[in-house]
Interface confidence: medium
């Protein structure tokens, strides 16, 4: 469905952008941005430019790179206000200024606005064949630019699911786009995967008033259970991809097992009780009955109390334009702890190792 | 002038389908969302979706998401909606608006066009 | 979505009387995403105030529109028999759009 996005990042911050390649004029890509549920992009700050860079640089486009390609931001110039050449901005102005983090961004202007004080002016970025930022360029707010920026903010996110035995993961964020990678969910984001045996299973992210959590998946608990034992960055393996070059053990063991003896493998536990409670139960072809579940545990992993500990992790997705989510389904919830920081973060207490590396996904789904 | 002309009564049997069509007249067709809009009888207001007829563009209300499906001819300046599988609950005026000078208002309306099941 | 609430949904005003109708959102809306339309019976609606405050082409100098973040208002300074209408706020702040369920004005 469209509008379509060619690529969005999100960041732990809760702040989402999102790219699109399509010639409309100004007030036309406001209101696709609102329309997704977003704002026309702003990029006021260092963090906004890191992302909006790493947009552009995930790839050129339609074009191909063979042109440069201007995006509408909101960035702006009343008709009362006039060219100011000594000013960052020329007298220009952000439509939604972010009193925390208003630095302005490191970009120049490709060319000088022109002198005047009584023509409303709008601006857009140009990006050096399509994928890197060269500067602001005033535009006449009628005319059309080649794509345009989003950005959507998100008071609270969930941390990445863990698939276990998942594969076909997909992810489709509340603005409308599918990706089959996400370290960042905002609320409403649905996550399906398939389980082993041609099963079905999915998940939502569902915001309460402080807090985000997968709808029927406790914290830690897998999408899909592991036939084996191990369990590595929350993916199913075998005990050889456990031991690194030095030997040493770095896997975490699945659920009715415990760390050996040996502290280099997993042995069945000697009391363990099956509960249902806090599953995601798998249903083939999504209708049919519950056909394993995913039991509940917790692991050691790693809290982080203060802001600047929260790993600032940016992501880039391809999107792609179809939804392949199946039915969810409905089980008991769980809120994984979040906790707001005076700078506005989100900060994710999670119960196993967060993203800390930046995925790179150029699938459509 | 900006003017939007709306299609005339349509009365539909249950599960039949019905294409309404909106002509826009005094600007740029291309270059603006056109919206829908529904009003069950005594009731209050509902977005259906819009489309951008520059490159047809669509964007929807979850909940009429498999019932209305927008289009738009750019020759003629005309936008249409189909809504399916109509049931007692579609009947309602609805309308066709776009934004023009205001903010994201809805700045210009057609007369409607009232449907009955 | 934001839910819009308006109140009261009837409320009578003779000739003259300041009126004054609310519009509560579910969730923070910016001041320029919430307008409001006036309604006639058998008639589209016509956008009356758009940004919270600004009147629309048209719209007399007595009708004002004030509030922000969950909080809107729309006011008359003194009732005339043409405003006698339906009036509903709308917010375009999220997606999806909504409007308020409308507030029925009536003379007395």
């Known amino acids: 469905e469209h509008p379509t996005a060619d690529r969005a990042a999100c960041s732990a911050s809760g702040a989402c952008y999102s790219l699109h390649h399509a010639t409309f004029k100004r007030r036309a890509a406001e209101e696709a941005c609102s329309l997704r549920g977003g704002t026309l992009s702003t990029v006021h700050s260092g963090s906004e430019f890191q992302a909006v860079l790493l947009l552009l640089r995930a790839g050129p486009g339609p074009g191909g790179g063979s042109k440069d390609l201007l995006f509408w931001v909101a960035l702006e110039r009343s008709i009362s206000q006039c060219t100011q050449e000594k000013e960052p901005l020329r007298g220009f102005s952000w439509l939604h200024p972010d009193s925390e983090d208003s630095e302005d961004s490191p970009l120049p202007w490709v060319e000088e606005p022109q002198r005047s004080c009584t023509v409303r002016k709008c601006a857009a970025l140009q990006a050096t064949r399509g994928v890197e930022p060269a500067g602001w360029k005033e535009m006449r707010c009628h005319l059309r630019t080649d794509g345009y920026l989003c950005k959507y903010q998100f008071e609270v996110l969930c941390p990445a699911p863990r698939p276990g035995a998942a594969s076909n993961l997909s992810f489709q964020a509340p603005f409308r786009l599918s990706s089959s990678a996400l370290d960042f969910s905002p609320p409403g984001t649905e996550v399906s995967a398939m389980c082993p045996g041609d099963l079905s299973v999915s998940s939502t992210c569902i915001q309460e008033e402080t807090s985000a959590h997968w709808d029927g998946l406790f914290p830690g608990t897998v999408l899909c259970p592991c036939s084996g034992r191990y369990l590595l960055a929350g993916k199913c393996v075998e005990l050889p991809d456990c031991l690194d070059h030095l030997g040493d053990f770095t896997c975490e063991c699945a659920v009715g097992f415990e760390l050996g003896k040996d502290g280099r493998s997993c042995e069945t536990k000697v009391e363990e009780q099956l509960t249902l409670e806090g599953t995601k139960l798998p249903t083939r072809n999504v209708t049919a009955t519950p056909a394993g579940a995913v039991t509940n545990r917790t692991w050691p992993g790693q809290v982080y109390d203060k802001p600047g500990e929260m790993p600032q992790v940016t992501e880039i997705l391809q999107w792609g334009t179809q939804s392949t989510l199946p039915t969810i389904q409905k089980t008991p919830q769980t809120k994984p702890k979040v906790t707001g920081t005076p700078s506005g973060s989100v900060v994710l207490n999670y119960t196993s190792s967060p993203p800390v590396s930046l995925t790179f996904d150029t699938s459509s789904t | 002038e900006v003017q939007l002309q709306q299609s005339g009564t349509v009365l539909a049997r249950p599960g039949a389908s019905v294409k309404m069509s909106c002509k826009a007249s005094g600007y740029t067709f291309t270059s603006y969302w056109m919206h829908w809009v529904k009003q069950r009888p005594g009731q209050g207001l509902e977005w259906i979706g819009a489309i951008y007829p520059g490159n047809s563009d669509t964007s929807y209300n979850q909940k009429f998401k498999g019932k209305a499906k927008l289009t738009a001819v750019t020759s003629t300046s005309t936008a249409y909606m189909e809504l399916s599988s109509l049931t007692n609950e579609d009947s309602a005026v609805f309308y066709c608006t776009h934004y023009y000078g205001s903010d994201y208002a809805m700045d210009y309306w057609g007369q409607g066009t009232s449907v009955t099941v | 979505q934001i839910v819009l609430t308006q109140s009261p949904a009837i409320m009578s005003a003779s000739l003259g009387e300041r009126v004054t109708m609310t519009c509560t959102a579910s969730?923070?809306?910016?001041?320029?995403?919430l307008h409001w339309y006036q309604q006639k019976p058998g008639s589209s609606p016509k956008l009356w105030i758009y940004s919270t405050s600004n009147l629309a082409s048209g719209v007399p100098a007595r009708f004002s529109g004030s509030g922000s973040g969950t909080s809107y208002s729309l006011t008359i300074s003194s009732m005339e028999a043409e405003d006698a209408a339906t009036y509903y706020c709308?917010?375009?702040?999220?997606?999806?759009?909504?409007f308020g369920g409308g507030t029925k004005l009536e003379i007395k």
């Open positions: 969730s923070s809306v910016s001041s320029s995403y």
């Open positions: 709308h917010q375009y702040h999220r997606s999806p759009r909504t």
